[in-house]
């Protein structure tokens, strides 16, 4: 089958600081040197691009300075971290991988990771 399979965890719980990390792994049908990874958020049938980065195999992922995502790569595996999450950001986060160079191009889309975000309870006032 000429397709690229992308695997990612089904569920991740964000930390109390609003940080969620997950691994996006792809089975490359070709020997790509340039890869683009995009994180998409699907909620209520609306899809928005959360962040995207293009990297050369063996090099680090570089997201834009104002991106809420950071990541590292190791072979056909990308470790993604999304920060600044709040309860309203709960949703399905889909990993999209594209093998950009050399040709042929391949597209792979994961099934998504459901990220649950719970806003921390405000600390009660202390009487001293």
């Amino acid at each position: 089958c000429k397709a690229m399979h992308v695997a990612q965890p089904a569920v991740v719980l964000a930390s109390s600081r609003g940080i969620a990390s997950f691994v996006c792994e792809y089975a490359s049908p070709g020997k790509a040197t340039e890869v683009r990874v995009t994180v998409l958020r699907q909620a209520d049938s609306q899809v928005t691009e959360v962040c995207a980065a293009t990297y050369m195999m063996g090099n680090e992922l570089t997201f834009l300075d104002d991106s809420i995502c950071t990541g590292t790569s190791s072979g056909n595996q990308v470790n993604l971290t999304i920060q600044g999450l709040r309860a309203m950001d709960t949703g399905l986060y889909i990993c999209k991988v594209e093998l950009m160079y050399p040709p042929p191009y391949y597209l792979g889309i994961g099934n998504g990771t459901q990220i649950y975000v719970i806003d921390p309870e405000p600390c009660p006032d202390s009487d001293f």
């Epitope: 089958c1 000429k2 397709a3 399979h5 683009r36 950009m100 160079y101 889309i109």
Partner: antibody, heavy 118, light 108 residues
């Protein structure tokens, strides 16, 4: 709403060149791959070329490789197809199409007709 | 290169009838990356189905897609007068991106 408008078609002699353009509006242009697809009179659809995101990666159909060049200007929101060494078999309606977020071609222009004839 | 073959080449039916269009991929492809388009004379193609079975926005529910691997099907449950057109399958999972030769659905 998404709009793609092609221009630049016309009648041209074999061996000559033409530059096709596609003006985009209604979406974040730099976030999408842009394709050219052609259709010869009475025939089916044939994918021609794609240019990705920042323009650094381009892929072509074997039938046009070395003769056609795709480019984009993300500031002007335009994608162009420079068609050189034209042959009779290049006669077709040339469509500009957006590669959607999931990869399929979700928006198409109305097309521009290129006729190669002596 | 992934080759898509469509059958039949022409389908002659009456309004209200059911249309079943076939698309075969060689080698096999993931259903995530198969789309169907409708094209009427003098118009650009219009996306109907993506991911083999998901209807595009604004497409009536009489259009449905199914299939996996090598065999895919587009079904029009009850043909309306505006459905008589040419239908193309398309794979977008790898380059070169390819289209089937099309199936023409015409009025009997």
């Amino acid at each position: 709403q998404v709009q793609l408008v092609e221009s630049g078609g016309g009648v041209v002699q074999p061996g000559r060149s033409l530059r096709l353009s596609c003006a985009a509006s209604g979406f974040t242009f730099s976030s999408y791959g842009m394709h050219w697809v052609r259709q010869a009179p009475g025939k089916g659809l044939e994918w021609v070329a794609v240019i990705w995101y920042d323009g650094s990666n381009k892929h072509y159909a074997d039938s046009v490789k070395g003769r056609f060049t795709i480019s984009r200007d993300n500031y002007k929101k335009t994608v162009s197809l420079q068609v050189n060494s034209l042959r009779a078999e290049d006669t077709a309606v040339y469509y500009c199409a957006r590669g959607g977020i999931w990869g399929y071609f979700d928006s198409w222009g109305q097309g521009t007709l290129v006729t190669v004839s002596s | 290169e992934i080759v898509l073959t469509q059958s039949p080449g022409t389908l002659s039916l009456s309004p209200g009838e059911r249309a079943t269009l076939s698309c075969r991929a060689s080698p096999s492809i993931s259903s995530s990356y198969l789309a169907w388009y409708q094209q009427k004379p003098g118009q650009a193609p219009r996306l109907l189905i993506y991911g083999a079975s998901s209807r595009a926005t604004g497409i009536p529910d009489r259009f449905s897609g199914s299939g996996s691997g090598t065999d895919f099907t587009l079904t029009i449950s009850r043909l309306e007068p505006e459905d008589f057109a040419v239908y193309y399958c398309h794979q977008y999972g790898s380059s070169p991106f390819t289209f089937g030769p099309g199936t023409k659905v015409d009025i009997k």
